[in-house]
């Protein structure tokens, strides 16, 4: 169904990480439009993008504001030029989107080594809370405001003359780790959320290593 | 020394809704801390009701979550637990906790080592 | 959830006896997130282990903790009159949250 000159949205596909949420879309639009909607399951459509000749659309504002719902988003093509036109049901073409609860599905994005300092045979290792686009109380939450310890850190860590590798873990953004007097150690970290099916792991930070900037020594 | 108090009506009736507060003193709720409310059925073992950080992030016990609620008031320094369409079988005594983060093994995870007195709630017509 | 069921239920001994409680879970526990607590009548539970082994501030030293995956043992090495109680394990790693029905020890 639909116009002779509109053809439908397909390939619609959710692109968030850290609760900053895009969605994205085929095809590159040639003489059409579109416009996104959004909807929690119970709740009422809104529109976004109006009358956009991009394939894509942040509705990061609108998942922000309650990232535990579940989210159902559509894309509706009308003629470039003619955005009054309809399609043959009397509305114009749309494509659903697949559900999407951004709590259970937003990539988690790579962590940072904030810090790490050294006293005597332990190491404080320090992971930057990074800040989110989740608002409460007119305040930005981070990253362990919203997930509280369904977030968990993996710290990997090696001597730098070596290749094998320890972990130790943490419900915190902090670790502390015992080492060897006299080596340096290099070390990077992983966000995890265990109890996730999908996405629960993020890419590993950049490395960072004793006797660079970061670090600090103190006997 | 951080001090919790639980506070709120020992009766309530068949269907209505529990509430209790928990204050905190000694300390700030929003200092890193997460913190949960645990109930005993009388004779009984303990049950995790569920649990909040500061930031209002909760978890819930999924045999409760349906009729759970657990809000922070920082201002306050308070918590508290809502639980709603009691029955006799709700009667018990209800405990807030603190959860604090313990150093283990690298890293830290939190356990429950500062909690309130309790305060019995009898669900009773 | 995770099942944690302990055993005995009751264990009759006297002061200066040693006591091991048993706590046994339907499914592996990191050791990470395995805690004791002790209860007195009329009291509200006290942290004793955390971490299955690590003894809680203040907790005396006759008072040890092991195990792992699924298996994991309070051990008092000489029961003093104060340590008669109830005892309950608890996991923290997985909701919900649980406790083992808990290990009643009483003065024989």
């Known amino acids: 169904s639909g116009t002779t000159n509109t053809v439908a949205a397909y390939n619609l596909t959710w692109k968030s990480t850290n609760f900053k949420t895009i969605l994205e879309w085929e095809p590159k639009p040639v003489n059409q439009v579109y416009t996104v909607q959004i909807s929690t399951k119970s709740g009422d459509w809104k529109s976004k993008c109006f009358y956009t000749t991009d394939t894509e659309c942040d509705l990061t504002d609108e998942i922000v504001k309650d990232v535990n719902q579940t989210y159902l988003a559509r894309v509706f093509s009308y003629p470039a030029g003619n955005v009054e036109s309809t399609g043959s049901a009397g509305e114009p073409l749309y494509e659903n989107s697949p559900e999407f609860t951004p709590y259970l599905e937003t990539n988690l994005g790579q962590p940072t080594i904030q810090s790490f300092e050294q006293v005597g045979t332990k190491v404080n290792v320090t992971v930057e809370d990074e800040r989110t686009l989740v608002r409460r109380n007119n305040t930005f939450l981070s990253l362990r405001d919203v997930f509280g310890k369904d977030l968990i850190y993996t710290l990997y860590y090696w001597k730098s003359s070596s290749s094998g590798k320890k972990t130790a873990k943490t419900n915190t953004n902090e670790f502390l780790i015992d080492v060897d007097k006299g080596e340096n150690y290099c070390f990077s970290v992983q966000a995890v959320i265990p109890s996730r099916t999908v996405n629960r792991k993020s890419t590993d930070s950049p490395v960072e290593c004793m006797g660079q900037e970061k670090g600090e020594f103190r006997e | 020394q951080v001090q919790l108090q639980e506070s709120g009506p020992g009766l309530v009736k068949p269907s209505q809704t529990l509430s209790l507060t928990c204050t905190v003193s000694g300390g700030s709720i929003s200092s890193g801390q997460y913190w949960s409310w645990i109930r005993q059925h009388p004779g009984k073992g303990l049950e995790w009701i569920g649990e909040?950080?500061?930031?209002?992030?909760?978890r819930y016990n999924p045999s409760l979550k349906s009729r759970v609620t657990i809000s922070v008031d920082t201002s306050k320094n308070q918590f508290s637990l809502k639980l709603s369409s009691v029955t006799a079988a709700d009667t018990a005594v209800y405990y807030c906790?603190?959860?604090?983060?313990?150093?283990?093994?690298?890293?830290?995870?939190?356990?429950?080592?500062?909690w309130g007195k309790g305060t019995t709630v009898t669900v009773s017509s | 959830e995770i099942v944690l069921t302990q055993s005995p239920g009751t264990l009759s001994l006297s002061p200066g006896e040693r006591a091991t409680l048993s706590c046994r879970a339907s499914?592996?526990?990191?050791?990470?997130?395995l805690a004791w607590y002790q209860q007195k009548p009329g009291q509200a539970p006290r942290l004793l282990i955390y971490?299955?082994?690590s003894r809680a501030t203040g907790i005396p030293d006759r008072f040890s903790g092991s195990g792992s995956g699924t298996d994991f043992t309070l051990t008092i090495s000489r029961l003093e009159p104060e340590d008669f109680a109830v005892y309950y394990c608890?996991?923290?790693?997985?909701?919900?949250?649980?406790f083992g029905g808990g290990t009643k020890v009483e003065i024989k």
């Open positions: 499914q592996s526990v990191s050791s990470s997130y």
């Open positions: 909040i950080y500061y930031s209002g992030s909760t």
């Open positions: 608890q996991q923290v790693g997985v909701v919900p949250y649980t």
């Open positions: 906790a603190r959860d604090t983060p313990y150093y283990y093994d690298g890293g830290y995870y939190y356990y429950m080592d500062v």
């Open positions: 971490g299955a082994s």
